[in-house]
Amino acid sequence: EEELQVIQPDKSVSVAAGESAILHCTVTSLIPVGPIQWFRGAGPARELIYNQKEGHFPRVTTVSESTKRENMDFSISISNITPADAGTYYCVKFRKGSPDTEFKSGAGTELSVRAKPSAPVVSGPAARATPQHTVSFTCESHGFSPRDITLKWFKNGNELSDFQTNVDPVGESVSYSIHSTAKVVLTREDVHSQVICEVAHVTLQGDPLRGTANLSETIRVPPTLEVTQQPVRAENQVNVTCQVRKFYPQRLQLTWLENGNVSRTETASTVTENKDGTYNWMSWLLVNVSAHRDDVKLTCQVEHDGQPAVSKSHDLKVSAHPKEQGSNTAAENTGSNERNIYGGSG
């Protein structure tokens, strides 16, 4: 009679974490008499996974009735697979004796475990940045296996190319993590923009995971200022407006200065929103011209989102007919008030 062979038909088996793994093993003969044992690994450090004869193996069940006399199928099912179960499993036939002796081994089945990556988490810079600046976004996902994974970056649906990705650890592990850093150049139109990190893995069946970051949390669009003198509303009164345009975020404080002295400070409240997500705001001053002998320099000074103040000035001619004139100046703040100036915003 032909000598018994131990057949493990599957060279490799891949199972998703949490599922059961079936490891197939058949023998070609009932002789010699003796039990089957399953091991993970080989050599002196191999681990016993199942012993047909004795022992308690709560995660292992036999696929067929291995206790039947004529049974030659010693396939097993291992439940609730985790990445730590990966390895090569050997079905080994023993010859009955005192003690039982190893008779023949199967060629082994390599079990690999597929584990899904966690939802990608995208984080941006700690501080806001202005248009034309390059900012870095990071994307992290953990717990996946096998190691092969694809990560892509998008900004508003357009794929980005300036990024660096690392999969850790470099060596072998039961599961892996991915970390990627992308560089994004901000534009003034980015308030409504999104940065997306997309992770594709064999466990996701072609349906990648995405993590997003809104550039509204990253960008700061500084305002443009325009100071204009409106037609005289009443004799001796001039209306001067400061148009604060295209700023983001909304946090903004405006100070009017008359000849360098603070006349009024207000905080942007009733702003209007532009299509691109930036804001506009207007503040006005009613100046009593008759109260002034000399020309008046009116300055609109704006502090946006905690940044250094920017300002725009307007020279109000008292002696002659008022004419519009604007220039950027360094901001003064003497803190004095002027009763002859009235203001408002809208």
């Epitope: 080989a42 050599g43 450090a45 023949k104």
Partner: antibody
């Protein structure tokens, strides 16, 4: 092609600890035993011990009290620490890969590092 | 521990001629599966050892077929059918049945 590279100090003072690291490149840690073997000047090969990918270790009984082998699969490295060294520990130290296909024994030490000379001297 | 004993310890050879090295183990290296846990290694001058034969008779990858291993139980032989100049060095037998792994003292092969 799997390659092994030993690294560590070439000179160790008596009574101090010898520390060597072996970096595995171009292959898998899994399903192999990772061994340290030494060769004193002009003498034969002496097995120090090995570690399996599952973390189990085996040591030469005469060295067991002084030797620790550890494995860092995340870096594809394994290490040897030998405490209380004496001049008798002067040798070329090899790291090596031992195959295990099935059964209780092993199937040959098939990949060797180039060896690193360690001298124990004050 | 299993003790491995080689003979001869020195072997002068002539290129083109055959050569033979013996190795004896203090206990059988034949496992119950029928597998023999005996390996042969060659250490060329100034180099690391390299595996020639494993399992008593299986040639390792890239090893020329002029090398062959035989024997079972406790007595083993490494044969070189035609010695070449590059075969000079020290040949070791080693057992891999149980820990500690042990090696023979080595046989130094040199050209006559």
């Amino acid at each position: 092609q799997v390659q092994l590279q030993e690294s560590g100090p070439g000179l160790v003072k008596p009574s101090e600890t010898l520390s060597l690291t072996c970096t595995v490149s171009g292959g898998s840690i899994r399903d192999y035993y990772w061994s340290w073997i030494r060769q004193p000047p002009g003498k034969g090969l002496e097995w120090i011990g090995f570690i399996y990918y599952n973390g189990r270790t085996f040591y030469q009984s005469s060295l067991k009290s002084r030797v620790t082998i550890s494995l860092d699969t995340s870096k594809n490295q394994f290490s040897l620490k030998m405490t209380s060294v004496t001049a008798a520990d002067t040798a070329v130290y090899y790291c090596a890969r031992v195959r295990a296909y099935s059964g209780i024994g092993l199937d040959g030490t098939d990949v060797w590092g180039q060896g690193t000379t360690v001298t124990v001297s004050s | 521990d299993i003790v491995m004993t080689q003979s001869p310890l020195s072997l002068p050879v002539t290129p083109g001629e055959p050569a033979s090295i013996s190795c004896r183990s203090s206990q059988s290296l034949l496992y119950s599966t029928g597998y023999t846990y005996l390996d042969w290694y060659l250490q060329r001058p100034g180099q690391s050892p390299q595996l020639l034969i494993y399992g008593g008779s299986s040639r390792a990858s890239g090893v020329p077929d002029r090398f062959s291993g035989s024997g079972s139980g406790t007595d083993f032989t490494l044969k070189i059918s035609r010695v070449e100049a590059e075969d000079v060095g020290v040949f070791y037998c080693g057992q891999a049945l149980q820990t500690p792994l042990t090696f023979g003292q080595g046989t130094k092969v040199e050209i006559k």
